[in-house]
């Protein structure tokens, strides 16, 4: 099974690498452009269906964009010697739809990886970390790009989507040292709520075209660095007052939160008093209320409390058939 | 009821400026954004940007950039939309809506004909 | 920009009938679509917000559906005044883009 594989040793791999003849410094692979100057490999569009093995010790930044990986196996980029001077991996729209424990190890350098686009079946909870144990060696990893990697309703697994995601997230607490963070088009409907705890370091993190419907179970308290949130895009109803103390005591923090179907309530009210006099909504006076349709339109900013009410719910006996 | 009125039809040469209007009557209307429309005929419904009255914030469609400007005047309840350096290609009915996630009540549409 | 398009530019029905209008995205736009009402004197009406949700004052002979990128609004009776032509807008990103409109005709 996935779970199996994933949690198998990468030590056999490294083994058959170590007895082939270490990759000549200045060769390039099959179906790939290199520039030594560039330090930049790029095998793109290739339909290649594993990861090449004599790539060069100068990469520094690898694209492996639009080919047909299908599985990232543990060690799939360990070399003899290591390749240690890549930082930049680009594995966006590779079909990839099973990324097993270890796959990334032995990349000392590796701090932007990108696997957009790639429909995950399975994320091995040991991905990024690399190790099943409890506290990992730090990964170098300061920027994480996984958006649209949300398979289709037929290949996922019974778990939970966004559990999957977050426990590769969080797994050894390996990225401590994240700054980037991006989790975009991914259908997520709720947001775990122990994931962003474990990334302290996070400057951006963008959360944009999903399903997130609240974030009253989220806790953004100790991303005293945030810099750019993005929200832009769910299905949010309304933030209330933790949330938005919580966003006002982040020092650096632009919140963007276009295109959400607000529902301008008496529940909204804690929301309009916080925008008006907020600084951190960037394009605050483009949020409008969605429903309900008396209020469809209505530009938040410009509310009163008098505009947001409730409807009475009546008790059974007074309710009529 | 909501209506939005808009200023009537206007004949102007090429490379002049022409500033429509479009009275707000029935609703708070400092309180919703009021958008400008475009419709040549063969070319169907064109937004051209957006702003909201109050604030004086604006948004414009990157094809109409330097060509539109849009401004507002509270007391009256008018929106403005100044056309600039006329060319036959802005001939067309131009409509002011009430929106912003739709359109909700329109103008009746102000010809602007440019010709030499 | 998204793109909008409505391959029925014209459409012919007769009065009673049920007529389905079609409208696609070139990428998913949420449910984020409107429909609109031009009759030929001008006058602008809308008819469906947010995919389904009818405007107050439509008829309810008038109804919308669909999701991704494909939407239609149908019109389950024909009826003289429906004589126009129908426009989709999506409201998912700017700039907000409309189809290219499809004029229904009476047989």
């Known amino acids: 099974t996935s779970s199996a594989s994933s949690s198998s040793s990468s030590a056999p791999f490294l083994a058959s690498a170590a007895s082939a003849q270490p990759p000549l410094p200045d060769q390039c692979p099959a179906l790939c452009e290199c520039s030594e100057a560039a330090r930049t490999v790029k095998c793109v569009n290739r339909n290649l269906t594993e990861v090449p093995t004599d790539l060069p010790l100068y990469v520094r930044n690898l694209f492996l964009t639009g080919n047909q990986l299908a599985v990232l196996p543990a060690g799939a980029f360990a070399r003899r010697p290591p390749l240690a001077e890549l930082a930049a991996l680009n594995l966006s729209g590779s079909r990839l739809d099973e990324v097993r424990g270890g796959a990334f190890e032995h990349l000392p350098s590796l701090r932007q990886l990108d696997l957009s686009h790639n429909p995950l079946a399975y994320l091995s909870p040991f991905a990024f970390s690399g190790s099943n144990a409890s506290i990992s060696a730090p990964s170098p990893l300061v920027e994480l790009i996984l958006n649209h990697i949300v398979p289709p309703d037929d290949k996922r697994q019974n778990r939970s989507f966004e559990g999957m995601v977050a426990a590769a997230l969080v797994a050894g607490r390996a990225l401590q040292g994240l700054h980037l963070l991006e989790l975009a088009s991914n259908h997520f409907l709720y947001l775990p709520r122990d994931v962003l705890a474990q990334l302290p370091s996070l400057r951006y993190l963008d959360l944009s075209n999903n399903s997130l419907v609240s974030l009253t179970y989220v806790s953004f308290r100790n991303l005293t660095h945030l810099e750019s949130l993005h929200l832009e895009d769910n299905a949010l109803k309304v933030l209330h007052n933790g949330t938005l103390a919580e966003l006002q005591g982040l020092p650096h923090v632009r919140v963007f939160l276009d295109n959400n179907p607000w529902v301008c309530d008496c529940h909204m009210a804690d929301m309009v008093t916080w925008l008006k006099q907020t600084g951190v909504v960037q394009g605050k006076d483009r949020l409008t209320c969605a429903f309900p349709e008396k209020m469809r339109n209505r530009v938040l900013l410009e509310l009163n409390s008098a505009d947001l009410d409730c409807d009475p719910i009546l008790p059974p006996s007074l309710q009529t058939s | 009821q909501v209506q939005l009125q808009q200023s009537g039809a206007e004949l102007m040469k090429p490379g002049a400026s022409v500033k429509l209007s479009c009275k707000a009557t029935g609703y708070t209307f400092t309180g919703y954004w009021i958008e400008w429309i475009k419709q040549r005929p063969g070319h169907g419904l064109e937004w051209i940007g957006e702003i909201l009255p109050g604030r004086g914030s604006t948004d414009y469609n990157e094809k109409f950039k330097g060509k539109a400007t849009f401004t507002a005047d509270t007391s009256s309840n008018t929106a403005y939309m100044q056309l600039s350096s006329l060319t036959t290609e802005d001939s067309a009915i131009y409509y002011c809506t009430r929106g912003r996630l739709d359109f909700t009540y329109w103008g009746q549409g102000t010809l602007v004909t440019v010709s030499a | 920009d998204i793109q909008m398009t409505q391959t029925t530019s014209s459409l012919s029905a007769s009065l009673g009938d049920r007529v389905t209008i079609s409208c696609s995205a070139s990428q998913g736009i949420r449910n984020y679509l409107n429909w609109y009402q031009q009759k030929p004197d001008g006058t602008v009406k809308l008819l469906i917000y947010?995919?389904?949700s009818l405007h107050s004052g439509v008829p309810s002979r008038f109804s919308g559906s669909g999701s991704g990128t494909d939407y239609s609004l149908t019109i389950s009776n024909l009826e003289p005044e429906d004589i126009a032509t129908y426009y989709c807008q999506q409201y998912s990103k700017v700039p907000w883009t409309f189809g290219g409109g499809t004029k229904l005709e009476i047989k």
């Open positions: 947010y995919t389904s």
